[in-house]
Interface confidence: medium
């Protein structure tokens, strides 16, 4: 543990002014594991002036950082890049004349205390004013800055010309597209200072590439995957003062696939379980021994779980007998295609056959027949390729 500091398994505190520390505290290689440190408290360290880029990176579990009544003048831009758990930062009564929001933009801070620093009135600190105004909590900090006349101005009254929040405008409010297709989003940003723009695509699976100048940009998404349905895409404008974003939700339409169809199981009712994927929601039709199965209160389709574009359910049968033994075919259809699967179901032995076996249906079998082509007008089985979803038409969404 550095001189003038005390260390425990989870905490470092340096409050002894003599001899004091001149650099951010670092642990010896064989001492406490820095990853377990959750709090660093530093006070009365007049010679501590800088936090360098690599000073804090080892403390990945750090949640609370306090440096008060010290000589802190400069914080490197990427000082907290690795400290994603940081929640509370207190830099009260230091020598900070400026502080960039870039230090903190990736952090989800619940508290940033900056009282008692000799900030210079400039656009560089306008983000702090904006942050304060956004918080609108009763315990707003009393922050000041020094103007050209070395006069203390309340930050709340600070007016800097050509220094405001940027704006982002994404041209694609309705983003519905068919799987396998491509789209291009356009975004324009504006503001003074002129903002940079970037795309936030989260965990988008589909291949994407962007072309971005300062105020104009496009994002091209190709061979769109159905896994990206429901995801959000944002265009972000960022300058010294803050950021703005405009977002769209991606809806991907694709043809149905029956991903699961199994032999009947008995619980409260008999159930032929199935899982169907498709968007928009596919229409389901059952066939029994090749003929349309007219559902009733005794035999009906039930969807038990819907997971975005995936539907888990049963063909539910009340007290089926040997008369219900046979081939059951499920067809799922939407406007992008259809899929078909079949199983043979055996509920009960035929009367007079002791072992319960039906010679016509010796074992329950599972067969994947792909997609029946002609009864719905398909010439290919689209759903066994990359499914192309929906209940309408490939290029328009009809739900």
């Amino acid at each position: 543990c550095p001189t003038s500091c005390k260390c425990s398994a989870s905490r470092i505190w340096c409050s002894d002014p003599s001899p004091g520390i001149v650099a951010f505290p670092r642990l010896e290689p064989n001492s406490v594991d820095p990853e377990n440190i959750t709090e660093i408290f530093i006070a009365n360290q007049k010679r501590l002036e800088i936090i360098n880029e690599d000073d804090v990176e080892a403390y990945v579990g750090l949640r609370n950082l306090t440096i008060v009544d010290s000589g802190l003048k400069f914080v490197a831009h990427k000082a907290f890049l690795k400290n994603s758990n940081l929640q509370h930062i207190n830099f009260t009564r230091n020598k900070l004349t400026s502080l960039s929001r870039k230090h903190f933009r990736h952090l989800d801070l619940s508290e940033l205390i900056l009282v008692g620093n000799p900030f210079t009135c400039s656009c560089d600190i306008m983000w702090i004013k904006t942050l304060q105004e956004a918080k609108s909590s009763p315990d707003t900090q009393d922050l000041y800055c020094l103007n050209e006349s070395s006069k203390n101005i309340p930050l709340a009254n600070l007016q800097i010309p050509n220094c405001g929040l940027p704006s982002a405008n994404l041209a694609a409010p309705n983003l519905t597209v068919e799987e396998g297709k491509s789209i291009t989003l356009s975004c324009s940003v504006a503001g003074d200072p002129v903002p940079n723009m970037y795309w936030d695509v989260g965990n988008l699976v589909s291949k994407h590439m962007n072309e971005t100048s300062h105020t104009q940009g496009s994002l091209r998404i190709t061979n769109i995957s159905s896994d990206d349905s429901g995801k959000q895409i944002s265009c972000v404008a960022e300058n010294l003062v803050g950021e703005d974003q405009d977002s769209v939700n991606l809806t991907v339409h694709f043809a149905p696939t029956i991903t699961f169809l199994e032999s009947p199981t008995s619980d409260h009712h008999w159930c032929i379980p199935f899982t169907v994927k498709g968007n928009p929601k596919p229409a389901l039709q059952w066939f029994y021994n090749g003929a349309i199965l007219n559902e009733s209160k005794y035999i009906c389709t039930k969807i038990h779980v819907t997971n975005h574009t995936e539907y888990h359910g049963c063909l539910q049968l009340d007290n089926p007998t040997h008369m219900n033994n046979g081939d059951y075919t499920l067809i799922a259809k939407n406007e992008y295609g259809k899929d078909e699967k079949q199983i043979s179901a055996h509920f009960m032995g035929w009367p007079g056959i002791d072992d319960g076996a039906n010679p016509n249906y010796p074992d329950v079998i599972y067969e994947d027949y792909g997609t029946a082509a002609n009864d719905i007008g398909d010439t290919t089985n689209r759903s066994n390729e990359i499914p192309s979803t929906d209940v309408t038409d490939k290029t328009g969404r009809e739900h």
Epitope: I331, I376, D393, T395, E398
Partner: antibody
């Protein structure tokens, strides 16, 4: 600007074969379905089917299944409608129409190809 | 035959309001699928007038409006003009096994 340009009018005899075309321009051709629509003289619009120019996936209306074939050549941004054996009842105006990506309806239509089948 | 039924004709004087209905079933409009409307002036290709029940493409005058309720949809022309004389067709997706897309039977609008 988006355009669908269809081939010119045809006069054929029953039993003959025919292929008419629809060429797209002004947009990414493989990104949109092309639909074929028939209009017999003095009658309404009938949906014949559609083709995805990207992979030549097709759907046919049951009324037209087996009588016509759709095909696509994405290198030339062209889709085709063909008959192997025309009948007098095939006399009609045939339209190709593009389905809008991300919205409903057929937003662009070809000018139509008039096919006359007469002995 | 079409699964979407429209009245064969409607007429009105200039400035009047006319409504065209499009009646479907539980496998198309009644299942929640969107309705599109097309205008076909004599001798020309059809033109998209309303998409997704209520949306007008750019360039379509605001006197044309669409609505949908249950298994039916309607196209309304308020302030009928001479150039509105044309055939009008509705269209929807049909989820029945034998269907894909269907146009309505068509309605001839005459401006008196």
């Amino acid at each position: 600007q988006v355009q669908l340009v269809q081939s010119g009018a045809e006069v054929k005899k029953p039993g003959e074969s025919l292929r008419i075309s629809c060429k797209g321009s002004g947009y990414s051709f493989t990104n949109n379905w092309i639909n074929w629509v028939r209009q017999m003289p003095g009658k309404g619009l009938e949906w014949m089917g559609r083709i995805d120019p990207d992979d030549s996936y097709t759907n046919y209306s049951p009324s037209f299944q087996g009588h016509v074939i759709f095909s696509a050549d994405k290198s030339s941004n062209t889709v085709y409608l063909q008959w192997s054996s025309l009948e007098a009842s095939d006399t009609a105006m045939y339209y190709c129409a593009r389905r809008a990506q991300g919205g409903g309806g057929y937003d662009y239509w070809g000018q139509g190809t008039l096919v006359t089948v007469s002995s | 035959q079409s699964v979407l039924t429209q009245p064969p004709s409607v007429s009105g004087a200039p400035g009047q309001r006319v409504t065209i209905s499009c009646t479907g079933s539980s496998s198309n409009i009644g299942a929640g699928f969107n309705v599109h409307w097309y205008q076909q002036v004599a001798g020309l290709a059809p033109k998209l007038l309303i998409h997704d029940n209520i949306n007008r493409p750019s360039g379509v005058p605001d006197r044309f409006s669409g609505s949908k309720s249950g298994a039916s949809a309607s196209l309304t022309i308020t302030g009928l003009q001479a150039e509105d004389e044309a055939d009008y067709y509705c269209q929807s997706y049909d989820s029945s096994l034998s269907g894909w897309f269907a146009f309505g039977t068509g309605t001839k609008v005459t401006v008196l």
